[in-house]
């Protein structure tokens, strides 16, 4: 806190300019009018104030706007945004995408800070859903943003927003998140033709059910092994050898290198060894010939 002292004669600030960097903290407190500061916030960013001086300027704004800053001020906070606490930001009502972009720019190149996370949360809640423009903006600044959301939060993403999602945006998503995103992607891309559809849906397939994988196997999609390895194990297990062969196309040879890893390992255990042998890859661990396979889970469901 800076002590309240009278502004020395001739030092009253008439505008926010570089002369203020020569003011001591108490002089800034005494000589800079908070209302003037609020209307000329955009100038602050072009002046090399010390961190201590910025603290004084923030304090002045806090006194002027105890209930939270108006958006006209927020949009021009620039570097001063990094001085804000999550508690400060929770008082704000940010509705403009331009304001959001301006503040994300300040934090560009850094990890998502608690301030930024709070800002995004306030913005999205204010909009009611993650619309395409917002998602475009957020994933441009933070490619991992989508995967930082809970399945519940992801449920508010409209299918139309899925068009903004790039493959790298899903890199850190877990199966529960993809379970929510996949049906939205399927809906968003439903009017595309086979090969184009597969290119778009591929990143989301970690949430695909068995019946959709069976359908894809009929379309000569040539799924790569990296995508196959990210599929849900429970979705892969019911696939036949012929279906997996059609699904992977020329990439089927990659199964050998992955035979000890899920979901390939678990899938092999469910196939007849005879059927696996037809692939000519030397895959071992299938059900020996002559054995009867009882699906106990089906039996339990019936009883």
């Amino acid at each position: 806190e800076v002590e309240k002292t009278a502004c020395p004669s001739g030092k009253k600030a008439r505008e926010i300019d570089e002369s203020l960097i020569f003011y001591k903290k108490w002089e800034l407190e005494a000589c800079v009018d908070a209302a003037l500061l609020a209307t000329q916030m955009d100038r602050v960013n072009a002046i090399p104030f010390t961190y201590e001086q910025l603290d004084v300027l923030k304090h002045k704004l806090d006194e002027l706007y105890p209930q939270g800053y108006p958006e006209s001020v927020i949009q021009h906070l620039g570097y001063l945004f990094l001085k804000m606490s999550p508690e400060d930001i929770r008082k704000w009502n940010v509705t403009s995408l331009e304001t959001l972009k301006a503040l994300l720019e300040v934090n560009k190149g850094h990890e998502m800070s608690p301030q930024v996370a709070t800002l995004i949360d306030r913005f999205v809640k204010g909009r009611g859903q993650l619309d395409k423009d917002t998602l475009d903006t957020l994933t441009a600044f933070y490619p991992g943003y989508l995967c930082s959301l809970s399945p519940e939060e992801l449920s508010s993403v409209p299918p139309s927003s899925i068009w903004a999602v790039r493959p790298q945006d899903l890199d850190t998503c877990d199966p529960r998140q993809l379970d929510v995103l996949y049906p939205k992607a399927r809906l968003a891309f439903q009017n595309m033709n086979g090969s184009e559809y597969f290119v778009k849906i591929q990143s989301f397939l970690g949430g695909a059910p068995t019946e959709d994988l069976k359908a894809l196997s009929q379309q000569n999609v040539s799924m790569d092994l990296a995508t196959f390895m990210k599929l849900r194990t429970d979705a892969v297990l019911p696939l036949t050898v012929a279906e997996v062969q059609k699904l992977l196309g020329p990439h089927v040879e990659g199964l050998k290198a992955e035979e000890r890893h899920r979901p390939v390992r678990d899938w092999i255990l469910r196939q007849r060894q005879d059927d696996l042998d037809t692939l000519g890859l030397g895959l071992q661990g299938g059900i020996p010939n002559g054995y009867l396979v009882l699906d106990l889970s089906m039996q339990e469901a019936l009883s």
């Epitope: 570089e18 960013n45 072009a46 002046i47 090399p48 104030f49 620039g78 570097y79 720019e105 300040v106």
Partner: nanobody, 117 residues
Framework: LQLVESGGGLVQPGGSLRLSCAAS????????IGWFRQAPGKEREGVSY????????NYADSVKGRFTISRDNAKNTVYLQMNSLKPEDTGVYSC????????????WGQGTSVTVS
Amino acid sequence: LQLVESGGGLVQPGGSLRLSCAASGFTLDYYAIGWFRQAPGKEREGVSYISSSGGSTNYADSVKGRFTISRDNAKNTVYLQMNSLKPEDTGVYSCAAAGGYSNSSRYWGQGTSVTVS
């Protein structure tokens, strides 16, 4: 991305020093630069300022007529020429850059020590 100051040292009263503030990893063209100093146990104070274009300069009253700030954008460096040094000019001098292309970036150097004795 950082600012690196150099040129400090020990000098007798009345002597001169030329401090440099060089940008590493980014270009200074769009940035306004300020020189600051901090004496032991005292508040950091602004010494000099130069606009991004170099067309505008400003100085603290205590150094006017003795210090001159300049910039060489080709060398990505800002200079502070200090003449007629006094014991009260002693302190750690650091430079700060503000503005940038998006007008929202800010960098600080670690400082260089100046002793007038």
